[in-house]
Interface confidence: medium
């Protein structure tokens, strides 16, 4: 695995992995993994990767199927990091509503909202 | 606040009553609130709303204002509501193999992503 | 507690096998990747591969593909790591040690060692 | 394979000194960096991962920091009880690969 791969070099590739090895991962007929039911997906991280770290102990390991988790932790990292830098800045409240306002006009034209 | 307002209708409120009470909610130069430094909001729901605690403490609250905060509060309790189900079902591989798909497909084309 | 408790200390004459056993309690077994990693005296630490106790997938090291297995029996919470074809450098302290997480390939319990002696 | 160049190989220092010993991975490895203690006759012991997490229950005295290909590994004031082999492990990718390791002894 190259390490400078961009995050979104790394995304692409672990799209084309997961495609691969889409028929080894559901082997496991009787396996159940906590799934979502909507799709703002940045609001399930956590649980998306608790999931991946269900199927990886239930997964034949070795070769590209490896390079497949070893991507997903990568993106995790990088997930990580970004979390991190949710509350690392103290700025002006002027700062902070612009900041809100956008996250609303975010939710307002792209989430999927089921009231 | 009608009790069953859909939430769309509820951010598109919210929003509007952010730009007239923006003068007011500014009034503290000395505040610091912790703004993320992306725009990937949906990572940072949660400091995102510890902001909104802290701005509400600071602010003279009456009339609209006070609308605001309520509707504000409404919509946390929408996204915690999200939260929760992140992680409600359990379902085949397959199922969480599209969800996975999907959050990279999202992050993929949409995410603002620095390597 | 987290335990790895691994089989006593063996002597084999050249070209014999050995199988070093390494029983787990205080988690569930297949939850967790075991890894064996070795220690010739004096010298530092070679990582040998790795054993899925669910899945029954490994990945071995290709300094040691040919000469080695990694099995487990879920029913007693053991994995066990077979070394082949042994010669007088396989002498070494053996260890099984788990891996801390599956986004993280680190070792956060191991075994107390079993010594294997090649000679002769 | 990664090759994981640690320094020195050995050190000598005095009780609350503070100690350094560095790691240099051959190829980049983000921050996928382990620090071992290992003691005669013991199994090693973990003491930092992901290059500057604290393991559970591991004094604050010990400490980690890097990224990419160097990698650095603190003792703030060296206690008797840290007279030991310390080993610094990637975790890239397979095959895992150790540093040769460090001595530490007491002045």
């Known amino acids: 695995i190259p390490t400078e791969i961009p995050t979104s070099a790394l995304v692409k590739e672990t799209l084309a992995l997961l495609s691969t090895h889409r028929t080894l991962l559901i082997a496991n007929e009787t396996l159940r993994i906590p799934v979502p039911v909507h799709k703002n997906h940045q609001l399930c991280t956590e649980e998306i990767f608790q999931g991946i770290g269900t199927l990886e102990s239930q997964t034949v390991q070795g070769g590209t199927v490896e390079r497949l988790f070893k991507n997903l932790s990568l993106i995790k990292k990088y997930i990580d990091g970004q979390k991190k830098k949710c509350g690392e800045e103290r700025r002006r409240v002027n700062q902070f509503l612009d900041y809100l306002q956008e996250f609303l006009g975010v939710m307002n034209t792209e989430w999927i909202i089921e009231s | 606040i009608p009790t069953e307002i859909p939430t769309s209708a509820l951010v598109k409120e919210t929003l509007a009553l952010l730009s007239t009470h923006r003068t007011l909610l500014i009034a503290n130069e000395t505040l610091r609130i912790p703004v993320p430094v992306h725009k990937n909001h949906q990572l940072c729901t949660e400091e995102i709303f510890q902001g909104i605690g802290t701005l509400e403490s600071q602010t003279v609250q009456g009339g609209t204002v006070e609308r605001l905060f309520k509707n504000l509060s409404l919509i946390k309790k929408y996204i915690d509501g999200q939260k929760k189900k992140c992680g409600e079902e359990r379902r085949r591989v397959n199922q969480f193999l599209d969800y996975l798909q999907e959050f990279l497909g999202v992050m993929n084309t949409e995410w603002i992503i620095e390597s | 507690e987290v335990q790895l408790v691994q089989s006593g200390a063996e002597v084999k004459k050249p070209g014999a096998s050995v199988k070093v056993s390494c029983k787990a309690s205080g988690y569930t077994f297949t939850d967790y990747i075991i890894h064996w990693v070795r220690q010739a005296p004096g010298q530092g630490l070679e990582w040998m591969g790795y054993?899925?106790?669910?899945?029954?997938?490994?990945n071995y090291n290709e300094n040691f593909k040919r000469r080695v297995t990694m099995t487990r029996d879920t029913s007693i919470s053991t994995a066990y790591m077979e070394l082949s074809r042994l010669r007088s450098e396989d002498t070494a302290v053996y260890y099984c040690?788990?891996?801390?997480?599956?986004?993280?390939?680190?070792?956060?319990?191991w075994g107390q060692g079993t010594m294997v002696t090649v000679s002769s | 394979d990664i090759q994981m160049t640690q320094s020195p190989s050995s050190l000598s220092a005095s009780v609350g000194d503070r100690v350094t010993i560095t790691c240099l991975a051959s190829?980049?490895?983000?921050?996928?960096v382990a620090w071992y203690q290992q003691k005669p006759g013991k199994a090693p012991k973990l003491l930092i991962y992901?290059?500057?997490r604290l393991q559970d229950g591991v004094p604050s005295r010990f400490s980690g920091s890097g990224s990419g290909t160097d990698f650095t590994f603190t003792i703030s004031s060296l206690q008797p009880e840290d007279i030991a082999t310390y080993y610094c492990?990637?975790?890239?990718?397979?095959?895992?690969?150790f540093g040769q390791g460090t001595k530490l002894e007491i002045k």
């Open positions: 190829e980049g490895i983000s921050n996928d």
């Open positions: 040690a788990r891996r801390i997480a599956w986004d993280h390939w680190y070792f956060d319990f």
């Open positions: 054993f899925n106790p669910n899945s029954g997938g490994s």
């Open positions: 992901a290059a500057s």
């Open positions: 492990q990637q975790g890239y990718k397979t095959p895992l690969t």
